[in-house]
């Protein structure tokens, strides 16, 4: 920062509120799309642009003239694999985190018009070209289409779709939020000759309902019904088809080929969790059990002559845990080397850090190429040469990201491409190759303002700089910034890292109330080296708070002795941790004791209640957004992947004992504020609910505020503004603040 | 059994508006399209459009400007009507399941004779 | 609009081979499908699919018909040929509209 040390005497305008709600400073994105081994498409007032990635010369791909007259508002493009055709999205309805529908129109690049004869429904739920040339498979109504030529009619692929039932290319809520993260169950094959789906049959489903107010001219309230399986409630089934899309008729009905999970997953309930081609005639999926300790990888070759997929039992690979759950959230996918015969995959290691290892399709046993006391993050790309990597082994800080590559001949000759290179400003990296891995964008989004620039794989060269917001770092000369503190203490022999975001002028000797921000949910991370502008940076510019964030046991990235130690027992060590943090802040001399304060959102908010709720009295006050309150209201595989099911044979009594509700009457001792949207759908609104029907029960006065027909974002413009004005209010009042 | 059986007027007059009926048994007509093709005395064959499930018409160029395909799905029919009628559009009428654009049933055909 | 030629008369003795060829005047594959379809009319009958895709016999089509070909030029060849066959064999595109049909190959017996 310019000017002075002494606060008092730094005119610079602080960050405010308004600033963080109005997004006053903006940071610059180079959002690029990679559409062959050396070109990207790059969006430039509005202009799509075709960049030469060596030489970094452009020429226009398509005009930002070329829609005027086509009366929609265009909200996304896809451009098809062979540069024919360029897919329009347009009436985007959001429904889930990942899931829209929306309507689509196919332009021809060649004939320069819009393909006006066999157009895509209206309310697709998803489309995705197949990854050469231009064939297009979409879903409608739960069902399954494809289009082998853009201006031709569709091969109707599945039959069976049924809204909230069966769900034929596309996943159900807890698939789409818990396993998948994302809308899509299709996955074409490299070259386009098939396309494997899932489906997922919902029929025993429990509904969660709530109601949604809408227009206030709507005299009954809708009632929305979701398929949303609770921890121990009935679960969606799966199953598993592949269709060979060059054998489609245009008489008889398409014939797709199923593939049963493995035997030791049809003994109970399971779930189908990763589907990777490794070549054109070869698929792996990953199954997870229920209890999800246990998956196993099947390895499919398509049978020419039968028609059929064949799993041979010899190349079944059986990923446990004997300490926890399989993952991070769920079995890591493999990496297929060029000829499908072996793959590269991330797994724990003994000691219980999650590495590298490569496995050969016929053999049980695989082999570590990376090993330590840190962990792999991704596996970003891997060529005949080098396999490259993102992870946090740089300087031993579990908060960093770095893009290493690693000699597939030699696995003792590991590069760092990007430790070097910015040192200062630069500890947080992701990526994005180039389709043969010959090009590469680094991301650098902290602790400096974020830097994007392209490289080459020839050599590691830095070709040149595509964003560098030198116009925000301008801008914010004239801000009184806060600065950020990332560092550990030691508990218990062990390491845990936290960060501090410290009010401009930070001098030690002064006493400065605190916010714990927290989230420590299984395998979470607060304490990073990543550059924000956000609440906490209007809490600390303006109104001189410390806002702090603390990884204890339950986080992630640091091995699984850290993260498994809250295995079948949420509620309990991460809440602790927060405590114990808050504790050893306290002790750090320019903490104000008495103003201690505690806020986090989803599993954060349960973590601020369950602490709120201790009768530690650390802390003076606290809020919660879309809190969790008690764990059989969550969906069940999140759920059931860190608590067992709610059986007294299995761990009823700790679902039990780790209610928010149990905790009410110690809320006396605290101010509390509870938010939540009516309109959640992922962390229901009944969880809030009961935690105010315990307070009032015993008698708790606490501020509350729900947020009409909002989900667990609060994300719509104005009630966006309102819980951070809302809450900054009460952080305020708890400070006694001005 | 499929069955598509055409029905209408096999005498037209020039200049007046040709309609005919294709009613549908053995499946929902919202199930497949369903194309009208003609057959001139000289045996050339005309696709002269289709009406998808969706409800949604598609015509021959040739003829766009004077014809509508429509349906009744109450009923399990469809219809053409072809206005301005000229000799030039004396021909058979048929009328066809059309799944991919192929059609694989077709009616016995509905004879149409354009005089005055 | 994509145009079939087909030639007009075909006289084949029975129990011989029948190629019946139909030329687009662009082509109407693409790397893996051929949007070419066979007819066959009878006197006083509606037409009936005999070939779809090429070379897919439709249902309740004898063995004895057969499609061939990709891209412009395309063959429906009937081996042996029976008095049943007597017919005019339509060809049909599907590749874009508005679909067009070959003017009809009529089947003679020698």
């Known amino acids: 920062n310019k000017g002075t040390d002494d606060a008092t005497a730094d005119s610079r305008k602080t960050y405010t509120l308004t600033d963080y709600l109005k997004n006053t400073y903006r940071l610059k994105l180079y959002s690029l799309r990679w559409i062959s081994d050396h070109e990207y498409l790059y969006k430039q007032e509005n202009n799509i642009l075709v960049f030469n990635a060596e030489y970094g010369n452009s020429s226009v791909f398509l005009e930002n003239s070329t829609f005027d007259e086509f009366g929609h508002s265009i909200n996304d493009y896809s451009i098809s694999p062979d540069g024919q055709f360029i897919l329009l999205e347009y009436n985007y309805v959001k429904q889930w985190r990942h899931s829209y529908t929306a309507s689509y129109d196919i332009y021809d690049l060649n004939k320069r018009q819009l393909i006006t004869e066999e157009r895509i429904p209206n309310n697709t739920q998803w489309v995705t070209w197949s990854p050469v040339g231009h064939k297009l498979a979409y879903v409608w109504n739960n069902d399954i289409y494809v289009k082998i030529e853009p201006n031709l009619p569709s091969y109707r692929i599945t039959w069976t779709g049924k809204e909230d039932i069966i769900y034929n290319g596309i996943t159900d809520w807890v698939y789409e939020e818990e396993v998948f993260s994302a809308y899509s169950a299709l996955w074409w094959s490299p070259n386009g000759t098939f396309l494997a789906y899932a489906q997922f049959n919902d029929t025993e489903v429990p509904l969660i309902e709530y109601s949604f107010y809408s227009d206030e001219s709507l005299q009954y309230p809708k009632t929305v019904r979701v398929p949303y399986p609770k921890a121990g409630a009935v679960n969606p089934t799966v199953k598993f088809f592949v269709v060979n899309t060059d054998s489609l008729s245009s008489v008889t009905n398409a014939t797709s080929i199923q593939i049963t999970a493995p035997a030791s997953m049809l003994i109970g309930d399971h779930y189908l969790c990763d589907v990777t081609w490794a070549t054109q005639e070869r698929i792996s999926l990953q199954w997870l059990r229920r209890i999800q300790n246990y998956s196993v990888m099947d390895i499919c070759d398509y049978d020419e002559s039968s028609g059929r997929w064949n799993c041979l039992v010899a190349r079944q690979h059986i990923e446990m845990s004997t300490t926890g759950w399989v993952g991070r959230f769920r079995p890591s996918e493999p990496h297929f080397t060029l000829d499908g015969n072996s793959f590269y995959k991330i797994i724990s290691n003994e000691e219980g850090y999650r590495h590298i290892c490569y496995f050969q399709i016929d053999k049980k046993d695989c082999t570590f190429i990376t090993k330590g006391t840190w962990e792999v993050i991704g596996i970003e790309a891997l060529t005949s040469d080098y396999l490259y990597y993102i992870s946090n082994e740089y300087k031993g800080m579990p908060g960093g990201r770095n893009l290493y590559k690693i000699q597939l001949s030699d696995y003792t000759k590991v590069t760092c491409l990007s430790c070097e290179l910015n040192p200062e400003r630069c500890q947080y990296y992701s990526v994005s190759f180039s389709k043969e891995a010959k090009y590469y964008q680094l991301r650098c989004s902290g602790p400096g303002l974020p830097l994007y620039t392209l490289h080459s794989s020839v050599n590691d060269k830095g070709l040149r700089v595509l964003e560098d917001n030198s116009a925000l770092d301008k801008m914010l000369q004239n801000v009184q910034m806060p600065s950020k503190k990332l560092d550990f203490i030691i508990l218990n022999e062990t390491k845990f890292w936290y960060q501090m975001i410290l009010p401009p002028h930070f001098d030690k000797s002064k006493k400065y109330p605190l916010l714990l921000d927290v989230y420590a949910g299984p395998c979470s991370q607060k304490a990073d080296t990543v550059f924000r502008l956000n609440w906490a940076t209007y809490l600390a510019s303006t109104e001189n708070i410390i806002v702090a964030s603390f990884d204890g046991r339950g986080s992630g990235y640091q091995g699984d002795k850290i993260m498994h130690a809250i295995n079948r027992r949420l509620g309990t060590f991460e809440v602790e941790d927060q405590i114990e943090a808050a504790r050893q802040f306290s002790k750090m001399g320019f903490v104000d004791n008495k103003r201690i304060a505690i806020w986090g959102w989803s599993y954060g908010g349960y973590v601020t209640s369950m602490v709120l709720g201790s009768g530690s009295g650390v802390f003076k006050c606290g809020i919660a957004v879309a809190p969790v309150s008690r764990w059989e209201y969550y969906d069940s595989v999140y759920t059931e992947r860190y608590m067992g099911l709610p059986t007294p044979e299995d761990n009823l009594d700790h679902y039990r004992n780790s209610t928010v509700m149990s905790r009410a009457e110690n809320f006396k001792q605290v101010e509390y504020l509870l938010i939540h949207g009516t309109a959640d759908d992922n962390v229901h609104f009944q969880q809030s609910a009961q935690i105010s029907k315990a307070l009032v029960d015993v008698g708790v006065d606490f501020q509350a505020m729900w947020y009409t027909d909002e989900d667990h974002g609060i994300a719509s413009s104005t009630a966006h503004q309102h819980i951070y004005t809302h809450m900054s209010h009460f952080i305020k009042q708890c400070f006694s603040l001005p | 059994e499929v069955k598509l059986v055409e029905s209408g007027p096999g005498l037209v007059k020039p200049s007046q508006s040709l309609s005919l009926t294709c009613s549908v048994t053995g499946y929902f007509i919202t199930g497949n399209y369903l194309a009208w093709i003609r057959k001139f005395p000289g045996n050339k064959m005309e696709w002269i459009g289709h009406?998808?499930?969706?409800?949604?018409?598609t015509y021959n160029p040739s003829l766009k400007s004077r014809v509508s395909i429509t349906r009744d799905t109450s009923k399990n029919q469809f219809f053409l009507q072809l206005n301005s009628v000229t000799s030039e559009d004396t021909a058979t009428y048929y009328c066809a399941r059309h799944g991919h654009y192929v059609m694989d049933v077709w009616g016995q055909g509905a004879s149409v004779t354009v005089s005055s | 609009d994509i145009v079939l030629t087909q030639s007009p008369v075909l006289a084949v003795s029975l129990g011989q081979r029948a190629t019946i060829s139909c030329r687009a005047s662009q082509s109407v594959s693409t790397s893996t499908y051929n949007f070419m379809h066979w007819y066959q009319q009878k006197p006083g009958q509606q037409p009936r699919l005999l070939i779809y895709?090429?070379?897919h016999l439709a249902s309740s089509v004898p063995a004895r018909f057969s499609g061939s070909g990709s891209g412009t030029d395309f063959t429906l060849t009937i081996n042996p040929v029976q008095a049943d066959d007597i017919a005019t064999y339509y060809c049909?595109?599907?590749?874009?509209?508005?679909?067009?049909f070959g003017s009809g190959t009529k089947l003679e017996i020698k």
């Open positions: 049909q595109q599907s590749r874009e509209l508005p679909l067009t």
């Open positions: 895709d090429a070379s």
């Open positions: 009406i998808k499930s969706s409800g949604t018409t």
